[in-house]
Interface confidence: low
């Protein structure tokens, strides 16, 4: 039988009455245009909603926007458009919400053609009040907050100036001209690229990379011949043009650009690209595009310095620079990532890794599913997940895969079961163990969200017709109840719940359409009365993550340690609550060869855990570039995987000798770098 129709599915008692008492409708006094929603702070209940409506006039387009505020998680909204002087807000800049619980908000206004600069509205009290500020420049990008100090803002102007404010947008100073890209680093550092000969596009590959650590008082040039740069975890990356040709290479720094090392990655040509897929303080997943318009490349994983890379996955689907990749970090279980590969027959298949890119495998076929027409053998196939690429191809996939750090082990995604991703209408699948096993959860495409740290899953069917029904599950998607939240169906546009999945409120957004008008409407449903009591100790059970063989002493060991979690029993209908903290008990594992990656010049043959020397490097001295010096590497081929905590057991020896010679790198060596002050 279909999910949710089994005999053992118990119904949640009196849920209709409980939900009816906690369903709040708000009709917005707006013609339907576009709507954007932002949460201000964490656990504050404050939501800002900006609606915009364009009226095309004969010669120009007249815009009108309204701003609404809720402080009860969306149950009630107040029109606060007068706080921003009824000004039209530019939606392309969105609402710039400050980091953490700063309560800061910046809205960028539309200004008339002849004005000297732009205009912003600033709030530092969770949008209770706004201050209008006229800018000395026209912004090109949204205001960017420093992660360390929300009073510090940076923005680029339409004239390519880099502007900084130290008092939350009250006063602005242009600290540099001819800037292409600027980013905040750690400790209020700003990194930016500059051009010399006319424009960012014309100088691509000849840009300079600059750094300021004092908000523009002084600068240091930390790189030349730059194509682009990026920050990931504690790593600063720059792609740098080679001296002789049009290829470029990745250089990496872990000291904010003072010293650089050449990453042991293939160089790329003009039509190719590098992309940082994921990065943390331990390591980086890097995609290197294949030559030609293939739509795929190779994933490499780095060592702890971001210098030595191991090939992780071939034929990784990534269409173009800034294009689509299905690479997804499964945040509900450590070490798990999902992505797609383009196989030799040009079909697209989903792969999963449970050990941070060490090994990739197909997803196990859900037990309650049949293989589809993509399968050569009707009894042997895999689950294939729809993500960004499928969405970009306008397939019937309303949402990307979903996981939440505090809903341990839960992954929800659209998928198909066969030998490859199918163009057919997908179903929704759920994993409760971080991707090891899967079950069909819902028939057909749905929108879905996780509430109360996994205590409730909510879903709405994806339909072109108006809807008035919401589905919810209190047992991780095994059984489903349906609730009619309104008599009058609405054209559904989105589900909104507070980021972090701790809330018990869900907002259903849509519009009503009558003969003469259409209006935005939201229904906010509070599930607090469905989960009547707080969860107690008896409601939780011990779960060993990554467990595949309970007989094995090392069962659950991933990256050198195993973790036991306290997880809510599926049968318990209770509140984890807003203050719920994931309880986990780690224990260290003995080291095995699986805890080491292959060092520079070594690789792992398929289905072998030993690292062997690359044939072309056999008998050669292994020399590589480190911090602008040439190093001589004496190694037996292993280096500990970044973040691996294993102890004892196997311990391959490794030694690096400094050759005390300069690298032949076209990148600036530290001595050549220059500084200047304003």
């Amino acid at each position: 039988s279909a999910p949710g129709e089994d005999e053992e599915c118990g119904r949640v008692r009196d849920f209709v009455a409980k939900l009816a008492n906690n369903t709040h409708q708000h009709v917005f006094d707006d013609l339907r245009g576009s709507v954007s929603l932002s949460w201000v702070g964490d656990s504050t209940g404050v939501i800002l909603v900006l609606t915009t409506f364009h009226v095309p006039l004969v010669i120009m387009t007249f815009g009108q926007s309204k701003l609404y505020r809720s402080e009860d998680y969306g149950k009630n909204f107040k029109d606060i458009t007068d706080l921003i002087n009824n000004t039209f807000i530019r939606t392309e800049f969105g609402m710039a919400i400050g980091p953490e619980n700063s309560g800061k908000v910046v809205l960028t206004a539309e200004v008339s053609g002849g004005s000297r600069g732009g205009r912003i509205f600033r709030s530092s009290d969770f949008a209770k009040n706004f201050v209008q500020t006229d800018l000395p420049f026209h912004p090109l990008t949204q205001m960017m907050y420093s992660p360390q100090n929300s009073d510090y803002l940076l923005a680029l102007s339409t004239e390519n100036g880099l502007w900084v404010s130290k008092n939350f947008g009250g006063k602005w100073e242009e600290i540099h001209k001819a800037v292409c890209l600027a980013k905040w680093g750690s400790d209020n550092t700003i990194f930016f690229t500059t051009y010399a000969n006319g424009s960012c596009k014309a100088d691509l590959g000849a840009l300079e990379l600059w750094r300021t650590s004092d908000l523009g008082k002084s600068f240091k040039t930390i790189g030349v011949k730059i194509y682009s740069f990026g920050l990931g975890g504690r790593f600063l990356f720059a792609s740098v043009m080679a001296d002789k040709d049009t290829t470029r290479r990745i250089h990496v720094s872990t000291d904010q650009g003072d010293t650089w090392s050449m990453a042991q990655l293939p160089s790329v040509g003009q039509e190719q690209f590098y992309s940082i897929l994921a990065a943390n303080d331990d390591m980086v997943f890097m995609h290197v595009d294949e030559p030609g318009d293939t739509g795929f490349g190779t994933i490499f994983t780095s060592d702890d310095r971001g210098i030595v890379y191991s090939k992780s996955l071939d034929r990784h689907l990534y269409t173009t620079t800034g294009g689509e990749t299905d690479f997804t970090n499964v945040t509900s279980l450590r070490g798990v990532y999902i992505t797609s590969v383009l196989s030799e027959d040009n079909s697209i298949q989903t792969m999963i890794t449970f050990d941070q890119g060490g090994r990739w495998t197909h997803l196990r076929k859900p037990e309650n599913s049949e293989c589809d027409a993509t399968a050569k053998n009707k009894n042997e196939c895999s689950l294939h997940i729809h993500a960004s690429y499928s969405i970009s191809q306008k397939l019937n996939v309303p949402m990307a895969p979903l996981s939440e750090p505090n809903a341990v082990g839960i992954v929800i995604a659209h998928g198909s079961v066969g030998d490859a991703i199918s163009v057919m209408v997908p179903d929704v699948y759920i994993s409760d163990d971080g991707g090891y096993s899967w079950t069909k959860m819902l028939e057909g495409p749905h929108y879905y969200t996780i509430l109360d740290s996994g205590g409730i899953i909510v879903a709405i069917e994806h339909s072109s017709r108006p809807i008035n029904v919401i589905k919810f599950s209190t047992d991780e998607g095994q059984c489903w109840q349906t609730y009619t939240f309104t008599r009058d169906p609405i054209y559904f546009t989105g589900l909104a719940s507070e980021p972090g999945a701790r809330s018990m409120n869900i907002s259903i957004w849509g519009f009503t359409e009558s003969f003469l008008t259409s209006q935005w409407v939201s229904y906010t449903i509070d599930f607090k009365d469905i989960l009547e009591r707080n969860c107690e100790e008896k409601d939780y059970t011990i779960w060993l993550a990554h467990s595949t063989d309970p007989e094995d002493y090392e069962d659950g060991c991933i990256l050198g340690y195993k973790e036991q979690f306290l997880r809510l029993r599926k049968s318990s209908v209770c509140q984890n609550g807003r203050d719920y903290v994931v309880t986990k008990q780690p224990s260290i594992c003995l080291c095995s060869l699986e805890d080491f990656l292959c060092d520079f010049g070594y690789y792992r043959p398929e289905n072998d855990s030993k690292c062997v020397e690359q044939p072309e490097l056999k008998g050669h001295d292994l020399e590589f570039c480190l911090y602008g010096r040439e190093e001589h590497l004496t190694t037996n081929g292993y280096r500990k995987i970044p973040g691996d905590k294993c102890q004892g057991g196997v311990n391959p020896v490794r030694e690096v000798k400094d050759l005390k010679k300069k690298c032949t790198s076209n990148f600036l060596s530290p001595e050549k770098q220059n500084s200047k002050s304003n």
């Epitope: 739509g295 009707k378 690429y389 191809q393």
Partner: antibody, heavy 129, light 107 residues
């Protein structure tokens, strides 16, 4: 040999429904998707939708959404296309066509499209009061 | 949806001559394109798939080229049995769409 044999011509009144069948032979029915394409008199070809013969899941062109239903019977290797609420502009020849492209989602750039390689002989549906 | 435009609508060619048919897509369809031939009272027949690969049993005088948005079907030396209507079709994005057709007639 591989062939698709469709049901005979139909004459229907406006508002009625028509159900056209397409029987496959000479290949493994569950290995290929089936597309339906129609052609109004003197007009070009128009794709209606596609069906997956194993799961029976479908994907329809927006224009026919809500009016068309594609089903299959694996025991007889037959695919059906039902069009409801018929109007005079639905008068056309309806073709089923084997569509290997359904075997995988269109990949980027390098993916090859295999085309609808086997067609039924067509079924003429006339809608007239 | 992707709109496919064929030109010319009608092409008058003498037997033995070369015929060049064009097909343009409103956005890139990469190489996910097929060409079909249809004669009066018959079902369409697949000629070319993947923009340039001849289907089984199709004579070498038929060739396809192009990628992205511009495609061409070339018949190097027209035979009497080649006078028909030719359609291009994309399968890059659903729904699959056909061009309006080019009728190749005897001059």
């Amino acid at each position: 040999q591989v062939q698709l044999v469709q049901s005979g011509a139909e004459v229907k009144k406006p508002g009625a429904s028509v159900k056209v069948s397409c029987k496959a032979s000479g290949y493994t029915f569950t290995k290929y998707y089936m597309s339906w394409v129609r052609q109004a008199p003197g007009q070009g070809l128009e794709w209606m939708g596609i069906i997956n013969p194993i799961g029976g899941s479908t994907s329809y062109a927006q224009k026919f959404q809500g009016r068309v239903t594609m089903t299959r019977d694996t025991s007889t290797s037959t695919v059906y296309m039902e069009l409801s609420s018929l109007r005079s502009e639905d008068t056309a020849v309806y073709y089923c066509a084997r569509d290997p492209s359904g075997i995988a989602l269109a990949g980027p750039a390098s993916r090859s499209y295999y085309g609808m390689d086997v067609w039924g002989q067509g079924t003429t549906v006339t809608v007239s009061s | 949806e992707i709109v496919m435009t064929q030109s010319p609508a009608t092409l008058s060619v003498s037997p033995g001559e070369r015929a060049t048919l064009s097909c343009r897509a409103s956005q890139s369809v990469s190489s996910n394109l097929a060409w079909y031939q249809q004669k009066p009272g018959q079902a369409p027949r697949l000629l070319i798939y993947g923009a340039s690969t001849r289907a089984t049993g199709i004579p070498a005088r038929f060739s396809g080229s192009g990628s992205g948005t511009e495609f061409t079907l070339t018949i190097s030396s027209l035979q009497s049995e080649d006078f028909a209507v030719y359609y291009c079709q994309q399968a890059r994005l659903g729904p699959w769409t056909f061009g309006g057709g080019t009728k190749v007639e005897i001059k």
